[in-house]
Amino acid sequence: EVEKTACPSGKKAREIDESLIFYKKWELEACVDAALLATQMDRVNAIPFTYEQLDVLKHKLDELYPQGYPESVIQHLGYLFLKMSPEDIRKWNVTSLETLKALLEVNKGHEMSPQVATLIDRFVKGRGQLDKDTLDTLTAFYPGYLCSLSPEELSSVPPSSIWAVRPQDLDTCDPRQLDVLYPKARLAFQNMNGSEYFVKIQSFLGGAPTEDLKALSQQNVSMDLATFMKLRTDAVLPLTVAEVQKLLGPHVEGLKAEERHRPVRDWILRQRQDDLDTLGLGLQGGIPNGYLVLDLSMQEALS
């Protein structure tokens, strides 16, 4: 807090310009009019103020707008945004994507701060849903953004926004998140032809159910092992050896290297050894010949 002192003669700021970098904090407090600052915020970002000087400018804006800054000021905050607390940001009403971009630009190259997270939350809540343009912007600045949302928050993503998602945006998503995103992706890409569809849907397949995997196995997709290893175990278990062979195509040989890891390990345990032997990969651990397999889940459903 800078104590109130009278502005020295001849130092009253008539505009926000470079001469202010020579002002001490108390002089900025005394000699810069808050309303002038608000109307010339776009200039602040071009002036090399120290971090401490920015504290004073923020204090002046806080006094002028105790209920929260108007968007006309927010859009031009620039580096002053780094001085804002989440509490400050919760008072804002940010509706323009341009404002969001301008503030994200200031934080570019850094981890998502609590301030940025609050800003994004305010913006998305104000819009009511995570539309394509917003998602495009957020994932451009923070590739992991989508995977930071809860399944509940992801449910507000319209299928049309899925077009903005790149494979790397889903790298840190867990199965619960992919469960929500997969049906949206399926809907978004439904009118694409087989090979194009697979390219687009591939990164979302961690949320795919068995019946969709079975359908894909009929389309010569040649799924790579990395994608296969990310599939839901419960979706892979019911697949037959023939279906997995069709699904993976030439990549089926990779199963040998992954035979001790889920979901491959669990899938092997469910297959007849005879069937596994047809792959010629030396996969071991299947059900020996002559054993009867009881599907207890089916029995429970019938009783």
Partner: nanobody, 116 residues
Framework: QVQLVESGGGLVQAGGSLRLSCTAS????????MGWYRQEAPGKERELVA????????NYADSVKGRFTISRDNAKNTVYLQMNSLKSEDTGVYYC?????????WGQGTQVTVSS
């Protein structure tokens, strides 16, 4: 991140002179707008005393006008502060800074003590 190393400080009698140097690790230094700041004591505000832009144009705080001269040698990636007619109120740690909006990195500073 650009490293800045200040040197040339020391103990000097009032009325004496010192020449401070600030060398930057960055190539392309000539494009940078540079400034010298003074901090009277730890925790106190750093005050800007002089700036020099890429074209060699200079500006000074009122308290040092006519006594201090800022200059640069782009070939050596160095900016200087020639301080003459030193006064006891010039005592403090002197820091140089690349005057770029959003850049708040400082060197370790160099101590200047003026005894009366």
């Amino acid at each position: 991140q650009v490293q800045l190393v200040e040197s040339g400080g020391g103990l000097v009698q009032a009325g004496g002179s010192l020449r401070l140097s600030c060398t930057a690790s960055e190539s392309g230094f000539s494009a940078n707008y540079m400034g010298w700041y003074r901090q009277e004591a730890p925790g106190k505000e750093r005050e800007l005393v002089a700036t020099i832009n890429r074209f060699g144009s200079t500006n000074y705080a009122d308290s040092v006008k006519g006594r201090f001269t800022i200059s640069r040698d782009n070939a050596k990636n160095t900016v200087y502060l020639q301080m003459n007619s030193l006064k006891s109120e010039d005592t403090g740690v002197y820091y140089c800074r690349i005057m770029r909006p959003g850049n708040w990195y400082w060197g370790q500073g160099t101590q200047v003590t003026v005894s009366s």
